[in-house]
């Protein structure tokens, strides 16, 4: 969490941002809140980005003002106009691109004063893994697949029964570039698995960590997946 205060003029207002990550090709949110004002027409929101000539987005007098919007962001940004009055200056960013990563500034002017806060935005690709039994293999084998990751992640297998065991000798991981030449499909195979055990396939890069679990018994197979973003810090 980053909390910024205005430093110029007689009055300052508190602006709060939260560092976050965007999944390329999908929509993302850059979070920013501020001390609300009672009059929408008195609120100015400016989003700026380090290295960008011009503005990422500007909202003033109750509407978007995009005359200085940089071409990199044209047609891809929106504020939640109905929530500005209650202090929400968050920016919706459509079709997140790798190049959107960087340091953003949320700058607010209201009748009470000015304030700003920076936000670190990371971009990459992350997806939920799915673990299945590979019935085509000669021995009991598990196959963990996740369709989109970037940058290249690490893959680690773990087992509930053999906690702390190193499975690198009995697993094989490959990365296949997807058609857009940036993200990659992750495939990891674990050999010599035993039944009545729960195995976890953990995929991690500097943006996200995802885990796919599979429990194999003689009577059933249970699966569970979850994904966690690693860098959500408020400022």
């Amino acid at each position: 969490l980053i909390i910024g205060f205005g430093i110029s003029g007689r009055h300052s207002i508190t602006v709060t941002t939260v560092a976050s990550a965007g999944n390329i090709g999908e929509d993302g949110i850059l979070s920013c809140t501020f001390e609300p004002d009672i009059k929408l027409s008195d609120i100015v929101i400016q989003w700026l980005k380090e290295g960008v000539l011009g503005l990422v987005h500007e909202f003033k007098e109750g509407k978007d003002e995009l005359s200085e919007q940089d071409e990199m962001f044209r047609g891809r940004t929106a504020v939640f106009a109905d929530q500005v009055i209650v202090g929400n200056a968050s920016l919706r960013l459509k079709n997140v691109q790798l190049t959107d990563a960087g340091t953003y500034k949320c700058y607010i002017i209201t009748s009470k004063g000015k304030g700003n806060a920076n936000l670190e935005y990371k971009t990459g690709a992350f997806s939920m893994p799915e673990v299945n039994v590979d019935y085509n293999a000669s021995s009991e084998t598990l196959r963990c697949e996740a369709p989109r990751w970037f940058p290249q992640p690490t893959v680690v297998w773990a087992s509930q029964v053999d906690q702390g065991a190193n499975f690198s000798e009995v697993s094989n991981t490959s990365f296949e570039l997807n058609s857009e030449n940036v993200t990659m499909k992750v495939v990891s195979v674990l050999y010599n698995v035993t039944i009545n055990n729960t195995y976890s396939c953990m995929i991690e890069n500097d943006i996200a960590k995802a885990t796919g679990d599979i429990k194999v018994t003689e009577s059933e197979i249970k699966r569970r997946s979850h994904l966690q973003l690693l860098n959500s810090k408020a400022s």
Partner: antibody
Framework: EVQLVESGGGLVKPGGSLKLSCAAS????????MSWVRQTPEKRLEWVAG????????YYSDTVKGRFTISRDNVRNTLYLQMSSLRSEDTAMYYC????????WGQGTSVTVSS | DILMTQSPSSMSVSLGDTVSITCHAS??????IGWLQQKPGKSFKGLIY???NLEDGVPSRFSGSGSGTDYSLTISSLESEDFADYYC?????????FGGGTTLEIK
């Protein structure tokens, strides 16, 4: 067809001034952030200054800050670079171009600073 | 400032060859990199932007790749019009900075 045509270069004495122009046609000039880049006689490239699409935001390299001023006229579709207190190390071919190294570049105008 | 180290500074190659030019940034630039071509006595032509995107009208034998601090421009099956100077430029931060250039010469 997109065209960027620079003019205003020439021979000038150290301490002198020049104003470069870059006339744009064939593109919606007001949509794009623009830059001036220079190429030294040794072929080294140096970014000089940039300006936002509407002209309110400008950035300069440290080597020219306080001496050069970038501006634009979106009605006349023209980018400018006012250069003052010129030094011998400002000698270069000056190019205007669309920001981010994207396509559209002018053919350049030569600036020589020498006594 | 971000330092862009480009290599090689020159290379002698033959028609039909595949060549790669690399640029190393002194810090991560999140694919905020472009590649430019300059023919002798001429201006610049943008080839690649955002690390991997081909500018309109640029032949598909040109491709860009890389992430973090390391990026490359690859030209497959070189044609006679490809013999020129090539530069990378980063636009993650101000000031924009360029690589030192690579001259492709006919062997």
């Amino acid at each position: 067809e997109v065209q960027l045509v620079e003019s205003g270069g020439g021979l000038v004495k150290p301490g002198g001034s020049l104003k470069l122009s870059c006339a744009a046609s064939g593109l919606t000039f007001s949509r794009y952030a623009m830059s001036w880049v220079r190429q030294t006689p040794e072929k080294r490239l140096e970014w000089v200054a940039g300006i936002s699409s509407g002209g309110s935001y400008t950035y300069y390299s440290d080597t020219v800050k306080g001496r050069f001023t970038i501006s634009r006229d979106n009605v006349r579709n023209t980018l400018y670079l006012q250069m003052s207190s010129l030094r011998s190390e400002d000698t270069a071919m000056y190019y205007c171009g669309r920001e981010y190294g994207r396509d559209y570049w002018g053919q350049g105008t030569s600036v020589t600073v020498s006594s | 400032d971000i330092l862009m180290t480009q290599s090689p500074s020159s290379m002698s190659v033959s028609l039909g060859d595949t060549v790669s030019i690399t640029c190393h940034a002194s810090q991560g630039i999140n694919s905020n990199i472009g590649w430019l071509q300059q023919k002798p006595g001429k201006s610049f032509k943008g080839l690649i932007y955002h690390g991997t995107n081909l500018e309109d009208g640029v032949p598909s034998r040109f491709s860009g790749s890389g992430s973090g601090t390391d990026y490359s421009l690859t030209i497959s099956s070189l044609e006679s019009e490809d013999f020129a100077d090539y530069y990378c430029v980063q636009y993650a931060q101000f000031p924009r900075t360029f690589g030192g250039g690579t001259t492709l010469e006919i062997k």
